[in-house]
Protein backbone atom coordinates (compact mmCIF):
# COMPACT_ATOMS: atom_id res chain seq x y z
CA UNK A 1 0.00 0.00 0.00
CA UNK A 2 1.04 3.63 -0.46
CA UNK A 3 2.96 5.55 2.18
CA UNK A 4 1.10 6.42 5.39
CA UNK A 5 2.15 8.97 8.03
CA UNK A 6 2.61 6.61 10.94
CA UNK A 7 2.65 8.25 14.36
CA UNK A 8 3.63 4.93 15.90
CA UNK A 9 2.40 3.55 19.22
CA UNK A 10 1.19 6.39 21.41
CA UNK A 11 2.14 5.02 24.81
CA UNK A 12 1.34 8.37 26.43
CA UNK A 13 -2.29 7.35 26.05
CA UNK A 14 -2.24 4.08 27.94
CA UNK A 15 -6.00 3.59 28.08
CA UNK A 16 -7.37 1.40 30.86
CA UNK A 17 -11.00 0.31 31.02
CA UNK A 18 -12.89 -2.06 33.27
CA UNK A 19 -14.02 -5.46 32.08
CA UNK A 20 -17.74 -5.83 31.37
CA UNK A 21 -18.35 -2.08 31.21
CA UNK A 22 -19.02 0.23 28.27
CA UNK A 23 -16.00 2.09 26.92
CA UNK A 24 -15.85 4.88 24.36
CA UNK A 25 -12.44 5.59 22.93
CA UNK A 26 -11.77 8.56 20.71
CA UNK A 27 -9.25 8.23 17.91
CA UNK A 28 -6.19 10.16 19.20
CA UNK A 29 -5.37 11.47 15.71
CA UNK A 30 -7.83 14.35 16.02
CA UNK A 31 -7.00 15.13 19.63
CA UNK A 32 -3.22 15.15 19.53
CA UNK A 33 -1.73 14.72 16.08
CA UNK A 34 -3.76 16.44 13.37
CA UNK A 35 -4.80 20.08 13.13
CA UNK A 36 -8.34 19.33 11.97
CA UNK A 37 -11.26 17.50 13.56
CA UNK A 38 -13.23 14.46 12.43
CA UNK A 39 -16.09 16.47 10.89
CA UNK A 40 -13.66 18.38 8.66
CA UNK A 41 -11.92 15.16 7.65
CA UNK A 42 -15.20 13.39 6.93
CA UNK A 43 -16.56 16.22 4.83
CA UNK A 44 -13.26 16.22 2.88
CA UNK A 45 -13.91 12.60 1.90
CA UNK A 46 -11.51 10.97 4.33
CA UNK A 47 -12.47 7.63 5.89
CA UNK A 48 -11.58 6.48 9.40
CA UNK A 49 -10.55 2.82 9.58
CA UNK A 50 -9.99 0.86 12.81
CA UNK A 51 -7.94 -2.30 13.34
CA UNK A 52 -6.11 -3.94 16.20
CA UNK A 53 -3.34 -6.27 17.31
CA UNK A 54 -4.27 -8.71 20.06
CA UNK A 55 -2.15 -8.90 23.18
CA UNK A 56 1.02 -11.00 22.60
CA UNK A 57 0.38 -11.16 18.84
CA UNK A 58 2.06 -9.37 15.92
CA UNK A 59 -0.74 -9.70 13.39
CA UNK A 60 -2.84 -6.63 12.70
CA UNK A 61 -6.44 -7.58 12.03
CA UNK A 62 -9.63 -5.68 11.32
CA UNK A 63 -12.05 -5.12 14.21
CA UNK A 64 -15.16 -7.25 13.99
CA UNK A 65 -18.08 -4.83 13.93
CA UNK A 66 -20.59 -7.65 13.34
CA UNK A 67 -20.65 -9.09 16.83
CA UNK A 68 -23.97 -9.91 18.54
CA UNK A 69 -25.76 -6.85 19.98
CA UNK A 70 -23.17 -4.63 18.24
CA UNK A 71 -20.79 -5.20 21.11
CA UNK A 72 -18.10 -3.23 19.25
CA UNK A 73 -19.16 -0.36 17.03
CA UNK A 74 -17.81 2.86 15.58
CA UNK A 75 -19.55 6.20 15.73
CA UNK A 76 -17.77 9.11 14.06
CA UNK A 77 -14.29 9.16 15.64
CA UNK A 78 -15.27 6.97 18.61
CA UNK A 79 -14.76 3.25 19.04
CA UNK A 80 -17.46 1.81 21.32
CA UNK A 81 -17.44 -1.33 23.43
CA UNK A 82 -20.83 -2.30 24.88
CA UNK A 83 -19.36 -3.84 27.00
CA UNK A 84 -15.65 -4.73 27.04
CA UNK A 85 -14.27 -8.24 27.45
CA UNK A 86 -10.93 -9.13 28.99
CA UNK A 87 -9.55 -10.34 25.67
CA UNK A 88 -10.20 -6.95 24.03
CA UNK A 89 -6.79 -5.96 25.46
CA UNK A 90 -4.34 -5.02 22.72
CA UNK A 91 -3.00 -2.23 20.54
CA UNK A 92 -5.64 -0.38 18.53
CA UNK A 93 -4.96 1.64 15.40
CA UNK A 94 -7.10 4.30 13.81
CA UNK A 95 -6.20 5.25 10.26
CA UNK A 96 -7.55 8.24 8.35
CA UNK A 97 -7.24 7.91 4.60
CA UNK A 98 -8.42 8.48 1.07
CA UNK A 99 -6.66 7.82 -2.23
CA UNK A 100 -4.09 10.57 -1.71
CA UNK A 101 -3.74 10.92 2.05
CA UNK A 102 -3.07 8.57 4.92
CA UNK A 103 -2.32 9.09 8.62
CA UNK A 104 -2.49 6.59 11.45
CA UNK A 105 -1.71 6.15 15.12
CA UNK A 106 -1.81 3.15 17.45
CA UNK A 107 -2.53 3.15 21.17
CA UNK A 108 -2.61 0.47 23.85
CA UNK A 109 -5.93 -0.52 25.41
CA UNK A 110 -5.92 -2.56 28.60
CA UNK A 111 -9.08 -4.18 29.91
CA UNK A 112 -8.66 -4.65 33.66
CA UNK A 113 -10.57 -6.60 36.27
CA UNK A 114 -11.71 -5.16 39.59
CA UNK A 115 -12.74 -6.88 42.79
CA UNK A 116 -15.89 -6.26 44.82
CA UNK A 117 -14.14 -3.39 46.63
CA UNK A 118 -13.09 -1.75 43.32
CA UNK A 119 -9.42 -2.68 43.75
CA UNK A 120 -7.68 -3.09 40.41
CA UNK A 121 -4.43 -2.33 38.54
CA UNK A 122 -6.11 0.84 37.22
CA UNK A 123 -3.99 3.99 37.62
CA UNK A 124 -6.07 6.34 39.75
CA UNK A 125 -6.33 10.09 39.28
CA UNK A 126 -5.62 12.10 42.45
CA UNK A 127 -7.94 14.89 43.55
CA UNK A 128 -6.57 17.27 46.17
CA UNK A 129 -8.89 18.85 48.72
CA UNK A 130 -7.87 21.68 51.01
CA UNK A 131 -8.10 20.89 54.69
CA UNK A 132 -10.96 22.63 56.54
CA UNK A 133 -11.64 24.91 53.58
CA UNK A 134 -15.33 25.34 52.89
CA UNK A 135 -17.46 22.90 50.93
CA UNK A 136 -15.48 21.11 48.22
CA UNK A 137 -16.75 18.67 45.63
CA UNK A 138 -15.37 15.92 43.48
CA UNK A 139 -17.14 14.95 40.27
CA UNK A 140 -17.53 11.46 38.86
CA UNK A 141 -14.97 11.61 36.03
CA UNK A 142 -15.10 10.52 32.39
CA UNK A 143 -18.78 9.73 32.04
CA UNK A 144 -19.64 12.32 29.39
CA UNK A 145 -20.95 10.94 26.12
CA UNK A 146 -22.08 7.57 27.45
CA UNK A 147 -25.79 8.42 27.60
CA UNK A 148 -27.95 11.30 26.37
CA UNK A 149 -29.06 14.07 28.74
CA UNK A 150 -32.60 12.69 28.61
CA UNK A 151 -31.40 9.55 30.45
CA UNK A 152 -31.26 9.96 34.23
CA UNK A 153 -28.68 7.52 35.59
CA UNK A 154 -28.43 6.37 39.18
CA UNK A 155 -25.14 7.20 40.87
CA UNK A 156 -23.83 5.40 43.93
CA UNK A 157 -20.72 6.61 45.74
CA UNK A 158 -18.36 4.45 47.80
CA UNK A 159 -15.41 5.18 50.05
CA UNK A 160 -13.20 2.14 49.76
CA UNK A 161 -15.63 -0.75 50.06
CA UNK A 162 -18.42 1.13 51.81
CA UNK A 163 -21.41 2.82 50.27
CA UNK A 164 -21.50 6.48 51.25
CA UNK A 165 -24.84 7.09 52.85
CA UNK A 166 -25.52 9.08 55.96
CA UNK A 167 -21.93 10.22 56.43
CA UNK A 168 -22.00 13.45 58.46
CA UNK A 169 -19.33 15.15 56.47
CA UNK A 170 -19.44 13.59 52.98
CA UNK A 171 -22.64 13.89 50.98
CA UNK A 172 -23.46 12.29 47.61
CA UNK A 173 -25.08 14.85 45.32
CA UNK A 174 -25.66 12.96 42.09
CA UNK A 175 -22.52 13.13 39.95
CA UNK A 176 -20.86 15.18 42.70
CA UNK A 177 -19.61 14.14 46.11
CA UNK A 178 -19.56 17.00 48.64
CA UNK A 179 -17.02 17.29 51.44
CA UNK A 180 -18.44 19.73 53.97
CA UNK A 181 -15.17 20.13 55.84
CA UNK A 182 -12.32 18.06 54.43
CA UNK A 183 -10.22 16.33 57.08
CA UNK A 184 -7.22 13.98 56.99
CA UNK A 185 -9.65 11.14 57.74
CA UNK A 186 -11.24 11.80 54.34
CA UNK A 187 -8.08 10.58 52.57
CA UNK A 188 -8.79 7.48 50.52
CA UNK A 189 -10.22 6.04 47.34
CA UNK A 190 -13.69 7.12 46.27
CA UNK A 191 -15.70 5.29 43.64
CA UNK A 192 -18.79 6.34 41.75
CA UNK A 193 -20.85 3.69 40.01
CA UNK A 194 -23.11 5.12 37.31
CA UNK A 195 -25.94 2.85 36.20
CA UNK A 196 -27.93 3.67 33.08
CA UNK A 197 -30.28 1.89 30.66
CA UNK A 198 -29.68 1.55 26.94
CA UNK A 199 -31.76 -0.44 24.46
CA UNK A 200 -33.26 -2.66 27.14
CA UNK A 201 -29.90 -3.36 28.76
CA UNK A 202 -28.40 -1.94 31.94
CA UNK A 203 -24.81 -0.73 31.94
CA UNK A 204 -22.50 0.27 34.78
CA UNK A 205 -19.61 2.71 34.69
CA UNK A 206 -17.13 2.49 37.55
CA UNK A 207 -14.79 5.40 38.22
CA UNK A 208 -12.36 5.50 41.15
CA UNK A 209 -10.21 8.41 42.25
CA UNK A 210 -7.92 9.08 45.17
CA UNK A 211 -8.71 11.97 47.47
CA UNK A 212 -5.75 13.58 49.21
CA UNK A 213 -6.39 16.27 51.80
CA UNK A 214 -3.69 18.95 51.61
CA UNK A 215 -2.77 22.22 53.34
CA UNK A 216 -5.19 25.06 52.87
CA UNK A 217 -4.19 28.22 50.99
CA UNK A 218 -5.65 30.28 53.83
CA UNK A 219 -2.94 28.81 56.10
CA UNK A 220 -0.14 29.14 53.56
CA UNK A 221 2.89 31.25 54.47
CA UNK A 222 6.12 32.22 52.67
CA UNK A 223 8.99 29.74 53.09
CA UNK A 224 10.34 29.53 56.64
CA UNK A 225 14.09 28.96 57.06
CA UNK A 226 14.68 26.98 60.26
CA UNK A 227 18.39 26.62 59.65
CA UNK A 228 20.72 28.46 59.36
CA UNK A 229 19.66 30.73 62.20
CA UNK A 230 21.10 33.24 64.63
CA UNK A 231 21.56 30.71 67.43
CA UNK A 232 24.06 28.42 65.71
CA UNK A 233 27.60 29.50 64.82
CA UNK A 234 29.66 27.24 62.54
CA UNK A 235 33.11 27.60 64.11
CA UNK A 236 35.80 25.62 62.32
CA UNK A 237 39.56 25.33 62.12
CA UNK A 238 41.20 25.19 58.70
CA UNK A 239 41.34 21.60 57.48
CA UNK A 240 38.14 20.57 59.21
CA UNK A 241 34.92 19.68 57.37
CA UNK A 242 32.31 22.43 57.18
CA UNK A 243 28.70 21.19 57.11
CA UNK A 244 25.87 23.73 57.05
CA UNK A 245 22.29 22.53 56.73
CA UNK A 246 19.70 24.75 55.11
CA UNK A 247 16.31 23.52 56.33
CA UNK A 248 13.22 25.17 54.88
CA UNK A 249 9.53 24.62 55.55
CA UNK A 250 7.12 25.19 52.64
CA UNK A 251 3.35 25.39 53.08
CA UNK A 252 1.48 23.27 50.56
CA UNK A 253 0.54 25.38 47.56
CA UNK A 254 -1.18 23.86 44.54
CA UNK A 255 1.18 23.85 41.53
CA UNK A 256 3.87 25.84 43.35
CA UNK A 257 7.53 25.13 42.62
CA UNK A 258 9.54 25.08 45.84
CA UNK A 259 13.19 25.97 45.48
CA UNK A 260 16.14 26.02 47.87
CA UNK A 261 19.65 27.09 46.94
CA UNK A 262 22.91 28.28 48.47
CA UNK A 263 25.03 31.21 47.43
CA UNK A 264 28.67 31.64 48.42
CA UNK A 265 29.81 35.23 48.27
CA UNK A 266 26.73 35.95 46.20
CA UNK A 267 27.48 33.25 43.60
CA UNK A 268 25.96 29.85 42.98
CA UNK A 269 28.31 27.04 44.20
CA UNK A 270 28.75 25.86 40.59
CA UNK A 271 30.20 29.25 39.67
CA UNK A 272 33.07 29.24 42.18
CA UNK A 273 36.27 27.23 42.35
CA UNK A 274 36.07 25.78 45.87
CA UNK A 275 35.31 22.08 46.29
CA UNK A 276 31.77 22.20 47.65
CA UNK A 277 29.06 19.53 47.54
CA UNK A 278 25.36 19.97 48.23
CA UNK A 279 23.03 17.13 49.19
CA UNK A 280 19.27 17.57 49.29
CA UNK A 281 16.57 15.65 51.12
CA UNK A 282 12.81 16.27 51.07
CA UNK A 283 10.10 15.19 53.50
CA UNK A 284 6.37 15.82 53.52
CA UNK A 285 3.75 16.21 56.23
CA UNK A 286 0.35 14.51 56.06
CA UNK A 287 -1.08 17.57 54.33
CA UNK A 288 1.84 17.74 51.85
CA UNK A 289 3.60 20.67 53.48
CA UNK A 290 7.22 20.19 52.50
CA UNK A 291 10.51 20.39 54.39
CA UNK A 292 13.61 20.61 52.21
CA UNK A 293 17.10 20.29 53.61
CA UNK A 294 20.19 21.14 51.56
CA UNK A 295 23.47 20.40 53.31
CA UNK A 296 26.41 22.42 52.07
CA UNK A 297 29.66 20.54 52.63
CA UNK A 298 33.30 21.58 52.23
CA UNK A 299 35.56 18.63 53.04
CA UNK A 300 38.69 20.58 54.04
CA UNK A 301 37.83 24.17 54.75
CA UNK A 302 40.49 26.86 54.36
CA UNK A 303 40.82 30.08 56.35
CA UNK A 304 39.70 31.87 53.15
CA UNK A 305 36.57 29.73 53.01
CA UNK A 306 35.77 30.67 56.61
CA UNK A 307 35.67 34.36 55.64
CA UNK A 308 33.09 33.81 52.91
CA UNK A 309 29.38 34.61 53.08
CA UNK A 310 27.13 31.51 53.00
CA UNK A 311 23.49 32.35 52.35
CA UNK A 312 20.58 29.95 52.12
CA UNK A 313 17.75 31.06 49.80
CA UNK A 314 14.23 29.72 49.42
CA UNK A 315 11.39 30.54 47.08
CA UNK A 316 7.77 29.46 46.59
CA UNK A 317 4.69 31.04 45.04
CA UNK A 318 4.24 32.79 48.41
CA UNK A 319 7.55 34.63 48.33
CA UNK A 320 11.32 34.49 48.62
CA UNK A 321 13.49 34.50 51.76
CA UNK A 322 17.18 34.24 52.56
CA UNK A 323 19.30 33.67 55.66
CA UNK A 324 23.07 33.87 56.13
CA UNK A 325 24.92 31.24 58.15
CA UNK A 326 27.22 32.45 60.91
CA UNK A 327 30.61 31.01 59.95
CA UNK A 328 33.86 31.89 61.73
CA UNK A 329 37.37 30.60 62.22
CA UNK A 330 37.99 28.97 65.55
CA UNK A 331 40.60 30.86 67.54
CA UNK A 332 43.22 28.25 68.52
CA UNK A 333 43.53 27.68 72.27
CA UNK A 334 46.91 28.70 73.72
CA UNK A 335 49.44 25.83 73.92
CA UNK A 336 50.10 26.16 77.65
CA UNK A 337 53.14 23.87 77.98
CA UNK A 338 55.27 25.86 75.56
CA UNK A 339 54.10 29.29 76.71
CA UNK A 340 54.54 28.54 80.40
CA UNK A 341 57.97 27.08 79.80
CA UNK A 342 59.04 30.21 77.95
CA UNK A 343 57.74 32.28 80.85
CA UNK A 344 60.11 30.49 83.28
CA UNK A 345 63.09 31.11 81.00
CA UNK A 346 63.41 27.49 79.88
CA UNK A 347 65.23 26.92 76.59
Amino acid sequence: SERCDDWGLDTMRQIQVFEDEPARIKCPLFEHFLKFNYSTAHSAGLTLIWYWTRQDRDLEEPINFRLPENRISKEKDVLWFRPTLLNDTGNYTCMLRNTTYCSKVAFPLEVVQKDSCFNSPMKLPVHKLYIEYGIQRITCPNVDGYFPSSVKPTITWYMGCYKIQNFNNVIPEGMNLSFLIALISNNGNYTCVVTYPENGRTFHLTRTLTVKVVGSPKNAVPPVIHSPNDHVVYEKEPGEELLIPCTVYFSFLMDSRNEVWWTIDGKKPDDITIDVTINESISHSRTEDETRTQILSIKKVTSEDLKRSYVCHARSAKGEVAKAAKVKQKVPAPRYTVELACGFGAT
Epitope: N166, N168, N169, I171, E173, S178, I181
Partner: antibody
Framework: QIQLVQSGPELKKPGETVKISCKAS????????MHWVKQSPGEGLKWMGW????????TYADDFKGRFGFSLETSASSAYLQINDLKNEDMATYFC?????????WGQGTTLTVSS | DIVLTQSPATLSVTPGDSVSLSCRAS??????LHWYQQKSHESPRLLIK???QSISGIPSRFSGSGSGTDFTLSINSVETEDFGVYFC?????????FGGGTKLEIK
Amino acid sequence: QIQLVQSGPELKKPGETVKISCKASGYTFTNYGMHWVKQSPGEGLKWMGWINTYTGEPTYADDFKGRFGFSLETSASSAYLQINDLKNEDMATYFCARYYGNFDYWGQGTTLTVSS
Amino acid sequence: DIVLTQSPATLSVTPGDSVSLSCRASQSISNNLHWYQQKSHESPRLLIKYASQSISGIPSRFSGSGSGTDFTLSINSVETEDFGVYFCQQSHNWPHTFGGGTKLEIK
Protein backbone atom coordinates in the same frame (compact mmCIF):
# COMPACT_ATOMS: atom_id res chain seq x y z
CA GLN B 1 -41.02 8.43 61.63
CA ILE B 2 -38.27 11.05 61.71
CA GLN B 3 -38.80 13.80 64.27
CA LEU B 4 -36.82 16.64 65.81
CA VAL B 5 -38.44 17.83 69.05
CA GLN B 6 -37.16 21.04 70.63
CA SER B 7 -37.50 22.29 74.19
CA GLY B 8 -40.23 24.78 75.06
CA PRO B 9 -40.28 28.59 74.95
CA GLU B 10 -37.85 30.50 77.14
CA LEU B 11 -38.14 33.87 78.89
CA LYS B 12 -34.78 35.26 79.98
CA LYS B 13 -33.22 38.49 81.19
CA PRO B 14 -30.30 40.20 79.43
CA GLY B 15 -26.98 38.76 80.63
CA GLU B 16 -28.44 35.33 81.45
CA THR B 17 -27.72 32.02 79.73
CA VAL B 18 -30.15 29.78 77.86
CA LYS B 19 -29.73 26.18 76.66
CA ILE B 20 -32.12 24.88 73.99
CA SER B 21 -32.37 21.15 73.29
CA CYS B 22 -33.23 19.27 70.12
CA LYS B 23 -34.04 15.56 70.48
CA ALA B 24 -33.88 13.43 67.35
CA SER B 25 -35.75 10.18 66.74
CA GLY B 26 -36.52 7.86 63.84
CA TYR B 27 -32.98 7.76 62.40
CA THR B 28 -29.37 7.17 63.42
CA PHE B 29 -28.46 10.42 65.14
CA THR B 30 -24.71 10.30 64.41
CA ASN B 31 -25.21 9.89 60.65
CA TYR B 32 -26.44 13.42 59.96
CA GLY B 33 -25.09 16.86 60.85
CA MET B 34 -27.31 19.03 63.04
CA HIS B 35 -27.63 22.68 62.06
CA TRP B 36 -29.11 25.66 63.87
CA VAL B 37 -31.09 28.43 62.22
CA LYS B 38 -32.26 31.72 63.76
CA GLN B 39 -35.45 33.52 62.76
CA SER B 40 -35.92 36.95 64.31
CA PRO B 41 -39.51 38.26 64.62
CA GLY B 42 -40.96 39.06 61.20
CA GLU B 43 -37.64 38.30 59.51
CA GLY B 44 -35.99 35.68 57.38
CA LEU B 45 -33.84 32.70 58.26
CA LYS B 46 -30.20 32.97 59.31
CA TRP B 47 -27.86 29.99 59.42
CA MET B 48 -25.93 29.87 62.69
CA GLY B 49 -23.69 26.87 62.09
CA TRP B 50 -23.66 23.15 62.71
CA ILE B 51 -22.27 20.34 64.77
CA ASN B 52 -20.87 17.13 63.35
CA THR B 53 -22.82 14.55 65.34
CA TYR B 54 -20.19 11.89 64.66
CA THR B 55 -17.10 13.82 65.81
CA GLY B 56 -18.74 16.49 67.98
CA GLU B 57 -16.90 19.20 66.06
CA PRO B 58 -18.88 22.49 65.93
CA THR B 59 -18.67 25.07 63.14
CA TYR B 60 -20.02 28.58 63.70
CA ALA B 61 -21.06 31.24 61.20
CA ASP B 62 -19.10 34.47 61.71
CA ASP B 63 -22.01 36.28 63.40
CA PHE B 64 -22.37 33.48 65.95
CA LYS B 65 -18.82 33.10 67.22
CA GLY B 66 -18.20 33.82 70.88
CA ARG B 67 -21.39 33.69 72.94
CA PHE B 68 -22.91 30.69 71.14
CA GLY B 69 -22.13 27.03 71.70
CA PHE B 70 -23.28 23.77 70.11
CA SER B 71 -23.01 20.52 72.03
CA LEU B 72 -24.25 16.93 71.94
CA GLU B 73 -25.50 14.18 74.17
CA THR B 74 -25.14 11.33 71.71
CA SER B 75 -26.59 8.70 74.06
CA ALA B 76 -29.81 10.74 74.19
CA SER B 77 -29.72 11.59 70.45
CA SER B 78 -29.82 15.24 71.47
CA ALA B 79 -28.16 18.42 70.26
CA TYR B 80 -27.98 21.63 72.26
CA LEU B 81 -27.66 25.31 71.54
CA GLN B 82 -26.36 27.45 74.40
CA ILE B 83 -26.36 31.26 74.28
CA ASN B 84 -24.42 33.10 76.98
CA ASP B 85 -24.72 36.74 78.10
CA LEU B 86 -28.10 37.16 76.41
CA LYS B 87 -28.82 40.38 74.56
CA ASN B 88 -32.07 41.89 73.27
CA GLU B 89 -31.10 41.03 69.69
CA ASP B 90 -31.05 37.33 70.62
CA MET B 91 -34.85 37.41 70.87
CA ALA B 92 -35.91 35.04 68.09
CA THR B 93 -37.14 31.57 67.25
CA TYR B 94 -34.34 29.01 66.99
CA PHE B 95 -34.67 25.91 64.82
CA CYS B 96 -32.56 22.79 64.72
CA ALA B 97 -32.50 21.11 61.31
CA ARG B 98 -31.10 17.80 60.10
CA TYR B 99 -28.75 18.27 57.17
CA TYR B 100 -27.88 16.01 54.30
CA GLY B 101 -27.09 18.43 51.50
CA ASN B 102 -30.20 20.39 52.49
CA PHE B 103 -32.39 20.75 55.56
CA ASP B 104 -34.79 17.86 55.15
CA TYR B 105 -36.22 17.78 58.70
CA TRP B 106 -36.73 20.69 61.09
CA GLY B 107 -37.56 21.00 64.74
CA GLN B 108 -40.74 22.90 65.64
CA GLY B 109 -38.68 25.87 66.86
CA THR B 110 -37.96 27.32 70.30
CA THR B 111 -39.01 30.91 70.94
CA LEU B 112 -36.61 32.88 73.10
CA THR B 113 -37.83 36.12 74.68
CA VAL B 114 -35.22 38.41 76.21
CA SER B 115 -36.68 41.09 78.44
CA SER B 116 -35.60 42.92 81.55
CA ASP C 1 -20.82 35.32 51.47
CA ILE C 2 -23.24 34.29 48.74
CA VAL C 3 -26.26 36.59 48.69
CA LEU C 4 -29.62 35.22 47.55
CA THR C 5 -32.16 37.79 46.35
CA GLN C 6 -35.78 36.70 46.09
CA SER C 7 -38.44 38.49 44.07
CA PRO C 8 -41.07 39.60 44.36
CA ALA C 9 -41.17 40.23 48.11
CA THR C 10 -44.95 39.67 48.07
CA LEU C 11 -47.16 37.97 45.52
CA SER C 12 -50.94 38.25 45.69
CA VAL C 13 -52.73 35.49 43.81
CA THR C 14 -56.09 33.83 43.47
CA PRO C 15 -56.38 30.06 44.05
CA GLY C 16 -56.06 28.34 40.68
CA ASP C 17 -53.47 30.82 39.37
CA SER C 18 -50.02 29.59 38.38
CA VAL C 19 -47.06 31.49 39.79
CA SER C 20 -43.28 31.73 39.49
CA LEU C 21 -40.99 32.82 42.31
CA SER C 22 -37.47 33.97 41.55
CA CYS C 23 -34.21 33.52 43.45
CA ARG C 24 -30.99 35.07 42.19
CA ALA C 25 -27.53 34.24 43.56
CA SER C 26 -24.67 36.76 43.76
CA GLN C 27 -22.34 34.18 42.19
CA SER C 28 -22.71 30.85 40.43
CA ILE C 29 -23.86 28.10 42.76
CA SER C 30 -24.36 25.37 40.15
CA ASN C 31 -27.54 23.54 41.16
CA ASN C 32 -26.90 23.74 44.92
CA LEU C 33 -30.15 25.56 45.67
CA HIS C 34 -33.14 24.37 47.68
CA TRP C 35 -36.65 25.73 48.22
CA TYR C 36 -38.63 25.76 51.48
CA GLN C 37 -42.17 26.70 52.42
CA GLN C 38 -42.95 28.22 55.82
CA LYS C 39 -46.47 28.75 57.05
CA SER C 40 -47.25 31.09 59.93
CA HIS C 41 -45.97 29.77 63.32
CA GLU C 42 -44.55 26.61 61.69
CA SER C 43 -41.08 25.41 60.81
CA PRO C 44 -39.89 25.47 57.19
CA ARG C 45 -40.58 22.46 54.96
CA LEU C 46 -38.31 21.28 52.12
CA LEU C 47 -40.10 21.51 48.75
CA ILE C 48 -37.42 21.17 46.07
CA LYS C 49 -33.77 20.15 46.38
CA TYR C 50 -30.85 20.81 44.03
CA ALA C 51 -32.82 23.36 42.00
CA SER C 52 -35.17 20.89 40.34
CA GLN C 53 -35.36 17.60 42.24
CA SER C 54 -38.75 16.78 43.71
CA ILE C 55 -39.27 15.64 47.30
CA SER C 56 -41.50 12.70 48.16
CA GLY C 57 -44.73 13.82 49.77
CA ILE C 58 -44.64 17.25 48.11
CA PRO C 59 -47.47 17.82 45.59
CA SER C 60 -46.42 17.65 41.94
CA ARG C 61 -47.70 21.18 41.32
CA PHE C 62 -44.40 22.41 42.84
CA SER C 63 -41.46 22.37 40.45
CA GLY C 64 -38.06 24.06 40.30
CA SER C 65 -35.70 25.08 37.55
CA GLY C 66 -32.48 26.99 36.97
CA SER C 67 -28.75 26.65 37.38
CA GLY C 68 -25.84 28.97 38.03
CA THR C 69 -27.30 32.20 39.35
CA ASP C 70 -30.98 32.24 38.34
CA PHE C 71 -33.58 29.91 39.84
CA THR C 72 -37.35 29.65 39.71
CA LEU C 73 -39.92 27.91 41.87
CA SER C 74 -43.17 27.33 39.98
CA ILE C 75 -46.53 26.46 41.48
CA ASN C 76 -48.98 25.18 38.93
CA SER C 77 -52.52 26.08 40.02
CA VAL C 78 -52.09 27.46 43.53
CA GLU C 79 -54.24 25.94 46.28
CA THR C 80 -55.29 27.64 49.52
CA GLU C 81 -52.86 25.51 51.56
CA ASP C 82 -49.95 26.94 49.52
CA PHE C 83 -50.14 30.41 51.07
CA GLY C 84 -47.15 31.30 53.22
CA VAL C 85 -43.53 32.37 52.81
CA TYR C 86 -41.12 30.67 50.41
CA PHE C 87 -37.38 30.73 51.02
CA CYS C 88 -34.50 29.65 48.80
CA GLN C 89 -31.25 28.42 50.38
CA GLN C 90 -27.82 27.69 48.92
CA SER C 91 -25.53 24.85 50.01
CA HIS C 92 -22.77 25.71 47.54
CA ASN C 93 -20.46 27.00 50.24
CA TRP C 94 -20.20 28.15 53.82
CA PRO C 95 -21.93 29.99 55.26
CA HIS C 96 -25.23 28.57 54.09
CA THR C 97 -27.46 31.50 53.23
CA PHE C 98 -31.19 31.97 52.74
CA GLY C 99 -33.03 34.38 50.51
CA GLY C 100 -35.19 37.05 52.15
CA GLY C 101 -38.35 35.16 51.25
CA THR C 102 -41.38 35.68 49.02
CA LYS C 103 -44.74 35.95 50.76
CA LEU C 104 -47.52 34.30 48.78
CA GLU C 105 -50.85 35.76 49.89
CA ILE C 106 -54.48 35.51 48.84
CA LYS C 107 -55.65 38.32 46.61
